[in-house]
């Protein structure tokens, strides 16, 4: 039978409290449950304690009390309680959530980027979020663009959401560059800075370290290194196709080298242990960045014994 949603002691969708206060939040449910917390609330933190107990009539319900001592502005966010996956139930895990604002007059923005702006990758025509969420829902925030320009929320293309920041539904060229969220609290002006950075889809080059046919003895290990070079503001997806792909014979490791001041270098290393005859054939490394696509392949030959 379907479980009733877990119930939180604080009702409604949001709750405002002052920084420095203690947050008490109880979750009551019909099964064992777990907490999901804002990123800045560490489960290992000494400030945080979670106590579990049996509760309800005949102790048949499951209760869990979350206590967060000396709550801070950056603990603002969603606190949710969800059932642990019940194996017999096909239903997605049921949860109850509340957004808690931890208000601090000295810190209107949850995340502050002052000296160095936070980089946000954007794509023209897509939604862009300037994530200057606030610690209290009644803070008035202005969105400014360098130099000396103000972007006005119109409730359609540009929307203000105190839990997210400014949501630009259809980002254009105009939103590329330095954007600043400003808020005045008690006569003090606070700013947090973002740099929207248009991602390109250029793939400069794709190579496999051994492009010539690869000759390998049966039982040996195959290692193929695929390298993709792109401009700095590009991200790629790298995939391999190979003869015994259906049995997931290969293990793939990925890494990115950003030490070069001109380009990003992405590596995808395919490894197959104890090569067999069924592993011979064409190995293809495919690189995709948005609509751009490049691939490179190499043939692998397997031999039973060494030859001269």
């Amino acid at each position: 039978s379907k479980l009733k949603d877990p119930e939180l002691s604080l009702k409604g969708t949001q709750h405002i409290m002052q920084a420095g206060q203690t947050l008490h939040l109880q979750c009551r449910g019909e099964a064992a449950h777990k907490w999901s917390l804002p990123e800045m609330v560490s489960k290992e933190s000494e400030r945080l304690s979670i106590t579990k107990s049996a509760c309800g009539r005949n102790g048949k319900q499951f209760c869990s009390t979350l206590t967060l001592n000396t709550a801070q502005a950056n603990h603002t966010g969603f606190y949710s309680c969800k059932y642990l996956a019940v194996p017999t139930s096909k239903k997605k895990e049921t949860e109850s959530a509340i957004y808690i604002f931890i208000s601090d007059t000295g810190r209107p923005f949850v995340e502050m980027y002052s000296e160095i702006p936070e980089i946000i990758h954007m794509t023209e025509g897509r939604e862009l979020v300037i994530p200057c969420r606030v610690t209290s829902p009644n803070i008035t925030v202005t969105l400014k663009k360098f130099p000396l320009d103000t972007l006005i929320p119109d409730g359609k293309r540009i929307i203000w959401d105190s839990r997210k920041g400014f949501i630009i539904s259809n980002a254009t060229y105009k939103e590329i560059g330095l954007l600043t969220c400003e808020a005045t609290v008690n006569g003090h002006l606070y700013k947090t800075n973002y740099l929207t950075h248009r991602q390109t889809n250029t793939i400069i080059d794709v190579q496999i370290s051994t492009p010539r046919p690869v000759k390998l003895l049966r039982g040996h290990t195959l290692v193929l290194n695929c390298t993709a070079t792109t401009p700095l503001n590009t991200r790629v997806q790298m995939t391999w196709s190979y003869p015994d792909e259906k049995n997931k014979r290969a293990s793939v490791r990925r890494r990115i080298d950003q030490s070069n001041s001109h380009a990003n270098i992405f590596y995808s290393v395919l490894t197959i242990d104890k090569m067999q005859n069924k592993d011979k054939g064409l190995y293809t490394c495919r690189v995709r960045s948005g609509p751009s696509f490049k691939s490179v392949n190499t043939s692998v030959h397997i031999y039973d014994k060494a030859f001269i």
């Epitope: 002052s114 000296e115 160095i116 702006p117 980089i119 400014k144 360098f146 130099p147 000396l148 060229y173 590329i176 560059g177 330095l178 600043t180 002006l189 700013k191 800075n193 740099l195 950075h197 248009r198 401009p231 700095l232 503001n233 001041s261 001109h262």
Partner: antibody, heavy 119, light 106 residues
Framework: QGQMQQSGAELVKPGASVKLSCKPS????????ISWLKQKPGQSLEWIAW????????SYNQKFTAKAHVTVDTSSSTAYMQLSSLTTEDSAIYYC????????????WGQGTLVTVSA | QLVLTQSPAIMSASQGEKVTMTCSAS?????MHWYQQKSGTSPKRWIY???KLPSGVPARFSGSGSGTSYSLTISSMEAEDAATYYC?????????FGAGTKLELK
């Protein structure tokens, strides 16, 4: 920490042009605003122009619109400023600087390029 | 364009002494930024957004002000503080700098 490496000193004749370069390192080139500034010996600083490396968009101090032209080359991660129709008044140290924070101040400065205009 | 007037033009202070220099704007500005420049070197960012100290700037430095009147203060002068200090605004285009205050060690 960001650094800005500028090209070496230039001795040029009146009426000629010169192209100065500025190569930032230590941060993603294309996500930066770079300004060019002028300082005559023993004097204060004058802002010439800024350019956003991500798009090539630029803005100039009206005083320098006929004098300076700023560009970027993303393939070599280098910013350039071309000064034309040089006169002795253009003799100065020229700095490139990366913008900080909200863009309205200059966080990292190059070592400067001394341009001397002399017949 | 907006004019910034720095005073005094030249000043000297003994080690340990408190130092204050001012920057006056010809019309109201939102923020003032300050740079330190030593002879033969490029300027360094010293104070931004009126009162914020970038990493690496000693805590004896502070900035304050609003509207048309801003100041930079050193709580206790050190020999390494001898330099020229420039104020800068960008509340209106183009950004402008003050003529500088040269601070010498007495």
């Amino acid at each position: 920490q960001g650094q800005m490496q500028q090209s070496g000193a230039e001795l040029v004749k009146p009426g000629a042009s010169v192209k100065l370069s500025c190569k930032p390192s230590g941060f993603t080139f294309s996500s930066n605003y770079i300004s060019w500034l002028k300082q005559k010996p023993g004097q204060s600083l004058e802002w010439i122009a800024w350019i956003y490396a991500g798009t090539g968009d630029a803005s100039y101090n009206q005083k320098f619109t006929a004098k300076a032209h700023v560009t970027v080359d993303t393939s070599s991660s280098t910013a350039y400023m071309q000064l034309s129709s040089l006169t002795t008044e253009d003799s100065a140290i020229y700095y490139c600087a990366r913008h900080g924070g909200d863009g309205y101040w200059f966080a990292y400065w190059g070592q400067g390029t001394l341009v001397t205009v002399s017949a | 364009q907006l004019v910034l007037t720095q005073s005094p033009a030249i000043m000297s202070a003994s080690q340990g002494e408190k130092v204050t220099m001012t920057c006056s704007a010809s019309s109201s500005v939102s923020y003032m930024h300050w740079y330190q420049q030593k002879s033969g070197t490029s300027p360094k960012r010293w104070i931004y957004d009126t009162s914020k100290l970038p990493s690496g700037v000693p805590a004896r430095f502070s900035g304050s002000g609003s509207g048309t009147s801003y100041s930079l203060t050193i709580s206790s002068m050190e020999a390494e503080d001898a330099a020229t200090y420039y104020c800068q605004q960008w509340s209106s285009n183009p950004p402008t700098f003050g003529a500088g205050t040269k601070l010498e060690l007495k």
